[in-house]
Interface confidence: low
């Protein structure tokens, strides 16, 4: 339905608080280097303008599209050219090209300092002095570091952030109350950002058909009692919401997400018995709850799929008449029966089924040709099952840190051209799959593990796209979304790689090592491990373990010494020499 003024429509739908929050997020995700104050000024100007349009929708410029209004506002930033370089050229374009141009310049790895957490008393004072500014600063800092963060969900995080401070700044032990909550928000936020980044990559790189297939599979697992027509409707609406958010249309996205939540809560009987507790919550919490809702119980009497998809003589006729609907139906029926499969596996099975029909429906005896199609699924199912089993056994044997190290070695050998910080970040996150998924019951392990790995590998793909260095990474990232993980799993030692020259500087450490947190120490050691593998890609596990054990002993010894710096200066070169000898 059309409105005379789009900006007035969204302001009225969302309310001033959410409107301002979303505009701040949008601007911060586009202009990631701009200072906070600059963004607040722009947001205030847009808000005042929106209010004039609410008062009179026929007022000057109120009929302009949101892209035009926001783009015009961004292009008023005086330092655009010096801060962003060629991004300033976007301002010479007309909509919709200008918005596309801004989107292309979003930086997944912006050169921003890590966020340092001040003392609790300092934070509480800032919160009490100016709560509104404090919360805006949170939105700004998260959005600029995560330019694809799901905007309406970020408002939910901000609400939780506010609640944590409101509660804990009055507590007897502020730190004990606040710090665990902030840690939880940080970890959940990073996970949420990475999950959304995969959704946007899926839409942007593989199109909405790929996203819709993902959504059919996931929603069918969550809502196995819902019928196909219902799942299809939810998929269509969800695709619109994510297309908008990934495209920078944050006001429309938040508005449509609220409509979807309303629809789901009004139609619970047709969707899932699990929605009830979500639907009593306020909007932001409700939408979050619906997105995270557990799978409903599977209907007890589901018949075999073979009747409709293998044994029926009408398979090819049905497929030919409506390929996407027929495949969608197959995916729905398979997914609702298999909450124990990862979404990516379900999509591989649908792809295999489609390939079989394409081949067999052109054969002399189609039925004979596709009669064994379900048997062909077995190796596809067993591959991730075995992978999860082996890696969980390894995780249980080694613990998280050493499991991460095993993955660091494995991935550095596969793709040694990738930058060391990226290999460390990605392998550390791959390693977290153990603690996240291996403790779960068997039926939940594969969906947890493989779908989490897809999110982490997407981060590798996104970072690699910015600075491509490996043909193998490009191939795995671009050929097939659903086969990314198997593609990376199948990579072997890169025989063509010319080992990196040894650089003593890389293995020189100082007394500041001793004051680092446990996590920072791990990252230092893991950085050294990656560099070792890049220097000696054919080093055995035993050789690398020996070097890393010596490294840990050397650091521990020097951190206990009275003159730490002198110890590092003396023992460091010995460690380097011993390592070179061990790896020779």
């Amino acid at each position: 339905d059309t409105h005379k003024s789009e900006v007035a429509h969204r302001f009225k739908d969302l309310g001033e608080e959410h409107f301002k929050g979303l505009v701040l997020v949008a601007f911060s995700q586009y202009l990631q280097q701009c200072p906070f104050e600059e963004h607040v000024k722009l947001v205030n100007e847009v808000t005042e303008f929106a209010k004039t349009c609410v008062a009179d929708e026929s007022a000057e410029n109120c009929d302009k599209s949101l892209h035009t209004l926001f783009g015009d506002k961004l292009c008023t930033v005086a330092t655009l050219r010096e801060t962003y370089g060629e991004m300033a050229d976007c301002c010479a374009k007309q909509e919709p090209e200008r918005n596309e141009c801004f989107l292309q310049h979003k930086d997944d790895n912006p050169n921003l300092p890590p966020l340092v957490r001040p003392e609790v008393d300092v934070m509480c004072t800032a919160f009490h002095d100016n709560e509104a500014t404090f919360l805006k600063k949170y939105l700004y800092e998260v959005a600029r570091r995560h330019p694809y963060f799901y905007a309406p969900e970020l408002l939910f995080f901000a609400a939780r952030y506010k609640a944590a401070f409101a509660e804990c700044c009055q507590a007897a032990d502020k730190a004990a109350c606040l710090l665990p909550k902030l840690d939880e928000l940080r970890d959940e936020g990073k996970a949420s950002s990475a999950k959304q980044r995969l959704k946007c990559a899926s839409l942007q790189k593989f199109g909405d058909r790929a996203f819709k297939a993902w959504a059919v599979a996931r929603l069918s697992q969550k809502f196995p009692k819902a019928e196909f027509a219902e799942v299809s409707k939810l998929v269509t609406d969800l695709t619109k919401v994510h297309t908008e958010c990934c495209h920078g249309d944050l006001l429309e996205c938040a508005d449509d997400r609220a409509d979807l939540a309303k629809y789901m809560c009004e139609n619970q009987d047709s969707i899932s018995s699990k929605l009830k507790e979500c639907c009593d919550k306020p909007l932001l919490e409700k939408s979050h709850c619906l997105a995270e809702v557990e799978n409903d119980e599977m209907p007890a009497d589901l018949p075999s799929l073979a009747a409709d998809y293998v044994e029926s003589k009408d398979v090819c006729k049905n497929y030919a008449e409506a390929k996407d609907v027929f495949l969608g139906m197959f995916l729905y029926e398979y997914a609702r029966r298999h909450p124990d499969y990862s979404v990516m596996l379900l999509l591989r099975l649908a792809k295999a089924y489609e390939a079989t029909l394409e081949k067999c429906c052109a054969a002399a005896d189609p039925h004979e040709c596709y009669a064994k199609v379900f048997d062909e699924f077995q190796p596809l199912v067993e591959e991730p099952q075995n992978l999860v089993k082996q890696n969980c056994e390894l995780f249980e044997q080694l613990g998280e840190y050493k499991f991460q190290n095993a993955l660091l070695v494995r991935y550095t050998k596969k793709v040694p051209q990738v930058s060391t910080p990226t290999l460390v970040e990605v392998s550390r996150n791959l390693g977290k799959v153990g603690a996240k998924c291996c403790k779960l019951p068997e039926a939940k392990r594969m969906p947890c593990a493989e779908d989490y790995l897809s999110v982490v590998l997407n981060r590798l793909c996104v970072l690699h796209e910015k600075t491509p260095v490996s043909e193998k990474v490009t191939k795995c990232c671009t050929e097939s979304l659903v086969n990314r993980r198997p593609c990376f799993s199948a990579l072997e030692l890169d025989e063509a790689y010319v080992p990196k020259a040894f650089n003593a500087e890389t293995f020189t450490f100082h007394a500041d090592m001793c004051t680092l947190s446990e996590k920072e120490k791990q990252v230092k050691k893991q950085t050294a491990l990656v560099e070792l593998v890049k220097h000696k890609p054919k080093a055995t596990k035993e050789q690398l373990k020996g070097v890393m054990d010596n490294f840990a002993a050397f650091v521990e010894k020097c951190c206990k010494a009275d003159d730490k710096e002198a110890c590092f200066a003396e023992e460091g070169p010995k460690f380097v020499a011993a390592s070179q000898a061990a790896l020779a």
Partner: nanobody, 115 residues
Framework: EVQLVESGGGLVQSGGSLRLSCAAS????????MSWVRQAPGKGPEWVSA????????RYAESVKGRFTISRDNAKKTLYLQMNSLKPEDTAVYYC????????GSQGTQVTVSS
């Protein structure tokens, strides 16, 4: 948009007959198996009967076997359920679904069998 609209329900004496229809739109009707499902007051949905896309293969719940007949007219994009020898326990809202689902996705049509 996928739409299913049921009709033909009503009040009938025990032993009587009714014929339910389900008009489909928004998808290739002939490509999909269809089912009839019913929900009695205060109870969960119960699968009644199913038919494949071509109309050759039909299946029935034990409680309706021999009394109900499912059929379809793909040219008219319509699914039917002929209900004979109706009993009070057949009283429910009847609705059609795509595939083998037992979830309510449409408004349904009320069937009331009085004794």
């Amino acid at each position: 948009e996928v739409q299913l609209v049921e009709s033909g329900g009503g009040l009938v004496q025990s032993g009587g007959s009714l014929r339910l229809s389900c008009a489909a739109s928004g998808f290739t009707f002939g490509s999909f198996g269809m089912s009839w499902v019913r929900q009695a007051p205060g109870k969960g949905p119960e699968w009644v009967s199913a038919i494949d896309g071509g109309g050759a293969d039909t299946r029935y719940a034990e409680s309706v076997k021999g009394r109900f007949t499912i059929s379809r007219d793909n040219a008219k994009k319509t699914l039917y359920l002929q209900m004979n020898s109706l009993k009070p326990e057949d009283t429910a809202v009847y609705y059609c679904t795509i595939g083998q689902s037992t979830s309510r996705g449409s408004q349904g049509t009320q069937v009331t069998v009085s004794s």
